[in-house]
Interface confidence: medium
């Protein structure tokens, strides 16, 4: 394995990131900030690339299948969380001329830097980005119900994952901004409804008088639908992330109709100041029953990385979040304020995750410059346990009843202890008979002076395609040294996040 020039492998890095994004089933498209390190190895006529990519989440859902550089800037009227990441990627190309780059594996760590970048200590308007998004499922359900009333073709859609939740509080009120994915769950699987995936952004505004989040003063929701027929049928997907299941590329994602414009849509979005200061939600009661159970039909997707898995996954692809809302809530009296405005404008029994405007207590203590705040060693084994190559904790989408067989394909590969993989309702182990490729770990938000912990690099060995010795692993251990001509330059427009990345790697 030899170091290579970071700028020389830019085409491969860009392509690899596109393939990673197209592999992912939840979250937001990664955009390339810079190539932090690059090595390559030549085995016969195959080139193996070992890349370290610094990325930032866009505001585009991965479901859009857009090319990462085609994602438009976020709506300036909505708070946009700034989430950075770093990915270690192993990719191969069969011959020098071939454009058939394949991603063999990838490990990413991501973290929000919104609070660390916030300079609002003295501002009366407070923005919170909540890590525990699942608690806002009720609000997503309410918003989707409104959307269904105005769009008949959404009748059989259900909320899948709550991706981001932001709250803006000011003197005029409170706005909750909820992003969530949806899935079509038709009663009858044949003929299959073409619009299987969707992504919605809901803005809910509350008066101070509101005692709960059941009745927003104003609710604005917009949804996009992504047609899987635009993507190839992947029932026979190849085992690696290469051309054959390029889901139609970035030009071919579509939305139903020119983006939906329901009655309360973005034309009359919220005014420049946020609305009334409203209450936080009660803990989610997890009542997600929407009528009788659906017949078990063919799932709309099979996992991208393996064709022999018995059950489809539309889910986490290893995305995990630390559970670090350790707030005690046992001191709440069960007293209700009926027909009475709570002086804080909040229901007295609501719970919140952390606030992001000031330097809150870091869940793992304060770790100043250069240290890895979450106890992650920059290289080698994950200190908390095995890497989740086989997703024992997988999402059943909102449509899928859990399988009867609860066996595992490989044990000991759940989330590391103390980590919580983000899951929707009714989650449990999902059997697999093959290894899932790639993982994304969501770490707690970074504070000023902290840097993003590096993703682990203990990838399992793999045989290269077309190799004489298919049983002999051909990948080398992921390089620990940094290439001399790396890191590359940060792409323009992202200077403020550069401080959160390590500039050099351990030699």
């Amino acid at each position: 394995v030899s170091p290579t020039d970071c700028s020389a492998v830019e085409p491969e890095a860009e392509k690899a990131l596109d393939l990673i994004n197209k592999r992912r089933r939840d979250g937001y498209l990664f955009q390339l900030l810079r190539i932090a390190d690059a090595h390559l190895d030549r085995v016969e006529n195959t080139t193996v690339y070992y890349l370290v990519l610094d990325v930032q989440e866009s505001d585009c859902s991965v479901l859009s299948r857009k090319y990462w550089n085609d994602c438009e800037p976020p709506d300036s009227r909505r708070p946009s969380e700034i989430v950075i990441g770093q990915c270690k990627v192993i990719a191969t190309r069969h011959s020098h001329e071939s454009q058939d780059l394949r991603v063999i594996d990838f490990n990413c760590t991501t973290s929000s830097v919104s609070s660390a970048l916030a300079n609002t200590k003295d501002s009366p308007v407070l923005i919170d980005f909540f890590e525990d998004t699942e608690r806002y499922r009720k609000q997503a359900n309410k918003a989707l119900e409104k959307y269904k009333e105005e769009n008949d073709d959404f009748a059989s859609f259900r909320v899948d994952r709550i991706e981001r939740v932001a709250r803006v509080r000011g003197g005029e009120g409170t706005g909750y901004f909820v992003d969530f994915s949806v899935r079509n769950c038709p009663r009858h699987h044949f003929p299959r409804h073409p619009n299987v995936f969707g992504f919605c952004r809901a803005d809910l505004f509350y008066d101070v008088e509101a005692l709960d989040l059941e009745s927003p003063k104003n609710l604005v929701i917009n949804c996009e639908v992504f047609d899987p027929q635009e993507h190839e049928n992947i029932n026979g997907v190849p085992p690696h992330l290469g051309h054959p299941f390029h889901w139609g590329g970035h030009e071919r994602s579509s939305t139903t109709k020119p983006p939906f414009k329901p009655h309360g849509s973005r034309d009359h979005h919220h005014p420049h100041k946020p609305h009334e200061h409203g209450p936080p939600p009660p803990p989610d009661e997890r009542d997600h029953s929407h009528g009788p159970p659906l017949p078990q039909g063919p799932p709309p997707l099979l996992p991208m990385s393996c064709s022999s898995c018995q059950h489809a996954t539309f889910g986490t692809n290893g995305a995990q979040r630390h559970s670090h809302n350790n707030n005690s809530s046992d001191l709440h009296p069960h007293k209700h304020h009926s027909h009475e405005q709570h002086p804080h404008g909040h229901h007295p029994h609501a719970h919140h995750p952390h606030e992001h405007d000031t330097h809150r207590q870091h869940p793992h203590g304060h770790h100043p410059h250069g240290h890895h705040p979450h106890g992650h060693h920059p290289h080698g084994h994950h200190p908390h346990g095995h890497h989740p190559h086989c997703h024992d904790f997988q999402d059943y989408g909102p449509c899928d009843p859990p399988p009867h067989n609860q066996g595992h394909c490989c044990h000991g590969h759940g989330p590391p202890p103390g980590h919580l993989r983000r899951r929707g309702p009714g989650k449990g182990p999902r059997p697999f008979h093959c290894r899932q490729i790639g993982s994304v770990y969501r770490l707690p938000p970074l504070r000023k002076g902290e840097v993003l912990p590096l993703p682990e690099a203990n990838f399992p060995s793999f045989p290269l395609p077309h190799h004489k010795h298919p049983l002999k692993p051909d990948n080398q251990p992921f390089p620990q040294s940094v290439s001399e001509s790396c890191p590359g330059k940060f792409k323009s427009g992202f200077p403020q996040v550069s401080m959160f990345f390590t500039h050099t790697f351990p030699k």
Epitope: P124, S329, L331, P333, P343, A350
Partner: antibody
């Protein structure tokens, strides 16, 4: 209903530390809001001292930053004020109060406790 | 720091009167102006927040208005129980209070 109650010594000697406790009932201090200390000097002037938020983050009045510390005990649903190196100028009635967030407005107040700094 | 000035430190009025107490900020505070009532026993109560929003349980005879740097609290029909000292407070930046206006009965 949220109720706050201050407690602590009513007399402190100069150069020593002033320590007060605010006990909150009817609401968990880790659920939401900012939990503040405000004092009122003889002659009625009110001064905001600082807060500890539900998440544990703190913010202090710059004029007191070198002397003040606000901490909490979530198991007892209490938050605390410590003011070091006090002088007779720190004689005041000390109030704890909760704010909807930060200090935009103080919705609930304790009844106040008078602290006299005197030799 | 933003200075808050209540020019009238004490005010005498008769029961049933309409009373207005004013407060001025040294700079624009974007409507983050709140009014508190402190009774003679020292208890403090929030009456009005964000310039004009009446807190639940506060009688409707209290009202607030203003913008920019100039704000006022009005009691439309003075009652005996309104005898107290009234403070304004800005919450646009680190909070500061006015010096208070003591309301007495003529």
């Amino acid at each position: 209903e949220v109720q706050l109650q201050e407690s602590g010594p009513g007399l402190v000697k100069p150069s020593q530390s002033l320590s007060l406790t605010c006990t909150v009932t009817g609401y968990s201090i880790t659920s939401d809001y900012a939990w503040n200390w405000i004092r009122q000097f003889p002659g009625n002037k009110l001064e905001w001292m600082g807060y500890i938020s539900y998440s544990g983050s703190t913010s202090y009045n710059p004029s007191l930053k070198s002397r003040i510390s606000i901490t909490r005990d979530t198991s007892k649903n209490q938050f605390f004020l410590q003011l070091n190196s006090v002088t007779t100028e720190d004689t005041a009635t000390y109030y704890c109060a909760s704010a909807s967030y930060r200090y935009a407005w103080f919705a609930y107040w304790g009844q106040g406790t008078l602290v006299t700094v005197s030799a | 720091d933003i200075q808050m000035t209540q020019t009238t430190s004490s005010l005498s009025a008769s029961l049933g009167d309409r009373v207005t107490i004013s407060c001025r900020a040294s700079q624009d505070i974007s409507n983050y102006l709140n009014w508190y009532q402190q009774k003679p026993d020292g208890t403090v109560k929030l009456l009005i927040y964000y310039t004009s929003r009446l807190l639940s349980g506060v009688p409707s005879r209290f009202s607030g208005s203003g913008s920019g740097t100039d704000y006022s609290l009005t009691i439309s029909n003075l009652e005996q129980e309104d005898i107290a000292t009234y403070f304004c407070q800005q919450g646009n930046t680190l909070p500061t209070f006015g010096g208070g206006t003591k309301l007495e009965i003529k």
